[in-house]
Interface confidence: medium
């Protein structure tokens, strides 16, 4: 996939809603310039597109929703990067201008007479991207034609500002309850001295920024803090290690605000330089219960407790997508190209024959084969039954007691749309209520996972609590097994009696060398040594003074 | 096969480089070239490590800044030892850390004999 | 970096016999062990990599066991040609080093 040619899904329909998926992964640091995207992604590229497909087959077959209107979708992919996806927004909005500008699809000829031939329809709305950083960027192009973006994946806390991000919406909450859910957890196991690293891009840094804010608040001190690129080359990820390992074995917990891809450069880079269990990763909803993230590289990821969005897998989607076949799925134009690199084979005379494989893919291949639903495929699908919802409650209102497009409608109105969106309120895919708040933002509910070793050589994620509104539970015994096997990073141990916290000049306030308070002296708080007056001498305990028993001396008594 | 060269008598004090050559194989593939001394009648003793594909070096925690380890080319590593004293006194070794077979050594040279004295 | 204690430092065994030895890591290592076989002016030879997995080309004479923090070699059937010293190394590398055992010193009787 290089910049000059970028394929399309369309499905037709009376209104058509636009959608970019990461079909591909993002283009390496030396493709950048030329945007040549990487390979093909199953969960975060074909399942997406196939979940818009199909979940757009099940609205048009649903009576009691958008009654008489057919919605057809236009996929794009957005590679996971800012510049393929602004690109592809800009095909969107063209074909909006093109459509606005004729009556009813006729073009109006250079020399004044007019042609049958007829527009694409404009695309009413927007799902995704995916990344925060490339939806940022998408939404600043589609704001200025009013066209709603809502988000299945965005969780970036600067996405709330509607005085910035007027038209977009998502169906996950902002990453500031992530950032909470984190400390929370951080908390609950005294981690007090823990080092940091996000992925470069807003996603990582406006959630790192919110830990590390609401760390300070609670009395966590950050060994350090990194940034880097997913894409970053091997000598970058060994680099960063290098430095994380410099504050062993103080600060053993690593809180990664990360996308999968840096989790998985930082694995690598693990066993390159051969730190397997000598961190733990605590890591944000860019992990998740990725096993793309995990795969080679189990025995680095052990111990790993990652926070995943709330979102059980969708069977009647893997009922549709599970009996796919190249042979006869012709509407998704990369789903050949997704077979080949799936079971690393050739599709022989297949229009995408791809020579790199030697070997024929055989009729016997299937996607049951160590399949793995998408983990946030409920909320690709709760982001298209809000566009649905919304076009549905705006059909309401405005053609009232009439099935179909009535004029008041046409052409759709972004505005009136977005505010319609804004109402919405329907149970999702899981059977949880769908609603926006005032920032067009949901509600936080999350899931706690940790990856482990199940048995030998075979590693699993296993949901050890859940952070819901604020409240955090965790099954302790699951994570840890035993008490004493709860990892520990602090930066110095508490002061033994008598003794009080120095901290060294530059130092965070969690590092500090213990002193004790001299023979006369008492501890008055946890940095002060006090003198006790004369007359008084310390307490047993050193928390104060007590007065000295005055002793009258007599001719007679004996030498002391 | 890996050689090393650049031993000999050195004086107290001085500092000491010694290079480790590979032939039939380039350090542009990703290993460990590491370093390790033997004193006259006794045991293995660590210095450090270089990893080729990124530059990233370990070392032992004894060599408190007086030893670098740094590629050259894709077929040398050098091993600088500075301040030699007459405990440095060793036949050093080169080897080779693989990833196939989780970064044990499975090549080494045949060792290059320094002798600290004035 | 993590301290390799290798006993006895030296055994003697009759051909035929069988000989082992034991290595001993401060912290867990999980299985990031290698065995050595060194004979007087050669270089070290690798035996056993990741605790039990024999190098290629070595007799399965040899057998390593252990993890964590406890590993054997097993030098069973015993022939002349076993003499040598034998060390254990940390292959943890990282923040644990690769640290040798003090070694073993066979003799063949």
């Known amino acids: 996939q290089s910049s000059e040619r970028r394929v399309v899904a369309h499905m037709p329909g009376d209104i058509i809603i636009g959608a970019l998926f990461s079909v591909h992964h993002q283009p390496t640091v030396d493709k950048v310039h030329e945007r040549k995207c990487g390979a093909v992604r199953e969960q975060y590229g074909i399942q997406r597109v196939e979940a818009m497909l199909h979940t757009l087959e099940r609205i048009n077959s649903d009576p009691t929703l958008l009654p008489n209107i057919t919605l057809g979708c236009e996929i794009r992919d957005s590679c996971w990067h800012s510049a393929v996806a602004l690109e592809q927004s800009i095909e969107f909005i063209r074909d909006s201008l093109i459509s606005s500008e004729e009556e009813e699809g006729l073009v109006r000829c250079v020399d004044g007479s007019s042609s049958s031939f007829r527009s694409k329809k404009p695309i009413v709305g927007v799902i995704g991207p995916g990344s925060s950083s490339v939806a940022i960027q998408v939404q600043n192009l589609l704001q200025l034609f009013n066209i709603p973006q809502i988000a299945y994946s965005a969780t970036s806390m600067d996405l709330s500002d509607k005085t910035l991000f007027k038209y977009f919406m998502r169906v996950v909450p902002s990453d500031a309850q992530q950032a909470r859910a984190m400390v929370d957890i951080v908390k609950r196991y005294n981690w007090t001295y823990v080092s940091a690293v996000h992925t470069e891009g807003n996603y990582g840094e406006s959630g790192m920024e919110a830990f590390k804010d609401m760390s300070a608040k609670e009395g966590i001190c950050i060994a350090h803090s990194y940034k880097i690129y997913s894409n970053a080359g091997e000598q970058s990820f060994d680099k960063l290690l290098k430095k994380l390992t410099s504050h062993l074995p103080k600060a053993r917990v690593v809180a990664c605000f990360c996308e999968g891809m840096t989790v998985r450069g930082l694995l690598m880079a693990m066993r390159r330089l051969g730190l397997a269990g000598e961190f733990l990763l605590l890591g944000s909803d860019g992990w998740a219960d990725r096993y793309d993230v995990t795969d080679g590289y189990q025995r680095e990821a052990v111990g790993g407790i990652t926070i995943k969005l709330q979102s059980p897998d969708v069977k009647w989607f893997d009922d549709y997508y599970l009996k796919l076949r190249p042979e006869t799925n012709h509407r998704n134009p990369w789903f050949q190209e997704f077979w080949q690199h799936r079971f690393q084979c050739r599709l022989e005379g297949f229009p995408q024959e791809n020579s790199k494989y030697n070997k024929t893919c055989n009729s016997s291949l299937t996607l049951k084969t160590h399949h793995v639903q998408d983990s946030k495929m409920g909320f690709v699908i709760n982001a298209i039954y809000s566009m649905a919802y919304g076009l549905h409650n705006m059909q309401m209102s405005l053609c009232p007691g009439y099935a179909g497009l009535c004029d008041a409608m046409k052409p759709i109105d972004g505005r009136k749309l977005l505010e319609s969106l804004m109402k919405t309120n329907f149970t999702g895919v899981s059977g949880d209520t769908i609603l926006f708040d005032e920032n067009g933002d949901s509600p936080g509910r999350y899931e706690i996972m940790n990856f482990k070793e199940m048995g030998k050589d075979y590693f699993d994620y296993i949901n050890v609590g859940s952070w819901d509104n604020g409240e955090l539970k965790m099954d302790d015994d699951e994570v840890w097994s035993k008490k004493s096997n709860i990892i520990r990073s602090v930066c110095s141990e508490p002061c033994e009696k008598g003794q009080i916290k120095v901290i060294r000049k530059g130092e965070v306030s969690c590092c500090w060398t213990c002193t004790p308070c001299k023979e006369n002296e008492y501890v008055f708080d946890e940095y002060t040594c006090k003198a006790c007056q004369l007359g008084s001498w310390p307490t047993d305990d050193l928390t104060g003074c007590d007065l000295i028993p005055v002793q009258y001396l007599r001719w007679g008594d004996p030498e002391p | 096969s890996l050689e090393e060269s650049g031993g000999g008598l050195v004086q107290p004090g001085a500092s000491l480089t010694l290079t480790c050559t590979a032939s039939g194989f380039s350090f542009s593939s990703n290993y460990w070239i590491c370093w390790v001394r033997q004193a006259p009648g006794k045991g293995l003793e660590w210095i450090g490590c270089?990893?080729?594909?990124?530059?990233?070096t370990w070392y032992a925690s004894w060599v408190n800044g007086r030893v670098t380890i740094s590629s050259t080319s894709s077929t040398t590593v050098t091993l600088q030892v500075n301040s030699l004293t007459a405990a440095d006194t060793a036949t050093y070794f080169c080897?080779?850390?693989?990833?196939?077979?989780?970064?044990?050594?499975?090549?080494w040279g045949q060792g290059t004999l320094v002798t600290v004295s004035s | 970096d993590v301290v390799m204690t290798q006993t006895p430092a030296s055994v003697s065994a009759a051909v035929g016999g069988t000989v082992t030895i034991k290595c001993q890591a401060s912290q867990s290592i999980y299985t990031n062990l290698a065995w050595y076989q060194q004979k007087p002016g050669q270089p070290p030879k690798l035996l056993i990599y990741k605790a039990s997995t024999l190098a290629s080309g070595v007799s399965s004479r040899f057998k390593g066991s252990g993890s964590g923090t406890e590993f054997t070699l097993t030098i069973s059937g015993v022939q002349c040609a076993d003499a040598a010293t034998y060390y254990c190394q940390c292959t943890g590398y990282g923040s644990s080093g690769w640290t040798f055992g003090g070694g073993t010193e066979v003799v063949v009787k």
């Open positions: 080897a080779r850390g693989s990833g196939d077979i989780a970064w044990a050594w499975d090549l």
């Open positions: 270089i990893y080729t594909g990124t530059g990233i």
